[in-house]
């Protein structure tokens, strides 16, 4: 069964700078990745970025830079808001649309005990959504 993992990382140098890393574990080719915050895409969440493996990126504040890291993983740098740990209690969700598997989505957030520079373990937190 395909899985999606989500890591939320606070930069060691800037406590208000965060990066979301997401990856897809499974066969098939990815056709689109959607990153949202505050909940899953289309279920109360607000879209932060859409990444297409050929056509590029669309992103919305506070996203600063969305990019592909590998063929099956992406990263999303979030804008420094000036506040200390502004995204500490926020849930980030990544939805991978793949062929022929369909859509798989998982969510994650920065662990409360995280030290700067550390990240959430790459354990998928599935929200039983496979379209």
């Amino acid at each position: 069964t395909p899985e999606v993992w989500v890591q939320v990382q606070m930069e060691a140098t800037e406590l208000s700078s965060f990066t979301v890393h997401c990856g897809f574990l499974g066969p098939g080719s990815i056709s689109l990745v959607t990153v949202s915050w505050g909940g899953p895409d289309g279920a109360g969440g607000t879209k932060l970025a859409v990444l297409h493996p050929e056509l590029g990126t669309r992103q919305w504040a506070p996203a600063r830079q969305a990019r592909w890291e590998t063929q099956s993983s992406i990263s999303l740098a979030l804008e420094d808001s000036g506040a200390s740990s502004p995204f500490a209690n926020t849930t980030f969700c990544c939805k991978f649309a793949s062929f022929p598997e369909g859509s798989w989505e998982s969510c994650g957030s920065l662990p409360p005990s995280s030290d700067p520079g550390l990240s959430a373990p790459p354990t998928p937190v599935p929200i039983l959504r496979a379209d």
């Epitope: 879209k47 859409v50 297409h52 590029g56 669309r58």
Partner: antibody, heavy 119, light 107 residues
């Protein structure tokens, strides 16, 4: 017919602010995000930023982050771009353009608004 | 930022000729490149999206090709109404960036 109608030319003084409007018609305004592009006289095009009319979410080219503010009024299907602290460098034609999120390109462009900054 | 280089600022051609306008990206942008045409005194108009797909209503004498870093807009059987500036655009990464433009002149 899909149309984007921009406000007319503006002559403004250095240091002032101004707002350009872009009224959409012929389609559902909230289904497409709106981008803004600058074209200085005789020069190329520069992407300023985009706004999602659905939720007001914005994205800016860092170069224009302190210069432009994008907003929308869903009730009138109009997008706005406010430009502040204007200098002669801001004299240009500004375009709004509709982003087709299915095919990933600017499929419709407005006629443009000429802004001249002069004392 | 990704730099899109259109090395030919001006190109001169004759009616009926075939002309190729090139655009080079400073890094791999897959097929996230469009071409826009701007006739004198007008706003830009979409020609080609996703490197090789024609926008609705664009004559088939306009062809886009390329992927990665090198892209080409080819106009076969050039017509007098093709006199315009042509711009490429990348939307692979933010900020989106345009090429400097190529002005097509008709002899």
């Amino acid at each position: 017919e899909v149309q984007l109608q921009q406000s007319g030319p503006e002559l403004v003084k250095p240091g002032s602010s101004m707002k350009i409007s872009c009224k959409a018609s012929g389609y559902t305004f909230t289904d497409y995000s709106m981008d803004w592009v600058k074209q200085s006289h005789g020069k190329s095009l520069e992407w300023i930023g985009a706004i999602n009319p659905n939720n007001g979410g914005t994205s800016y080219n860092q170069k224009f982050k302190d210069k432009a503010t994008l907003t929308v009024d869903r009730s009138s299907s109009t997008a706005y771009m406010e430009l502040r602290s204007l200098t002669s460098e801001d004299s240009a034609v500004y375009y709004c353009a509709r982003w087709d999120s299915d095919y990933w390109y600017f499929d419709v462009w407005a006629t443009g608004t000429t802004v001249t900054v002069s004392s | 930022d990704i730099v899109m280089t259109q090395s030919q600022k001006f190109m001169s051609t004759s009616v009926g000729d075939r002309v190729s306008i090139t655009c080079k990206a400073s890094q791999n942008v897959r097929t996230a490149v469009d071409w826009y045409q701007q006739k004198p005194g007008q706003s830009p108009k979409a020609l080609i999206y996703s490197a090789s797909n024609r926008h609705t209503g664009v004559p088939d004498r306009f062809t886009g090709s390329g992927s990665g870093t090198d892209f080409t807009l080819t106009i076969s059987n050039v017509q007098s109404e093709d006199l315009a500036d042509y711009f490429c655009l990348q939307h692979w990464n933010y900020p989106y960036t345009f090429g400097g433009g190529t002005k097509l002149e008709i002899k």
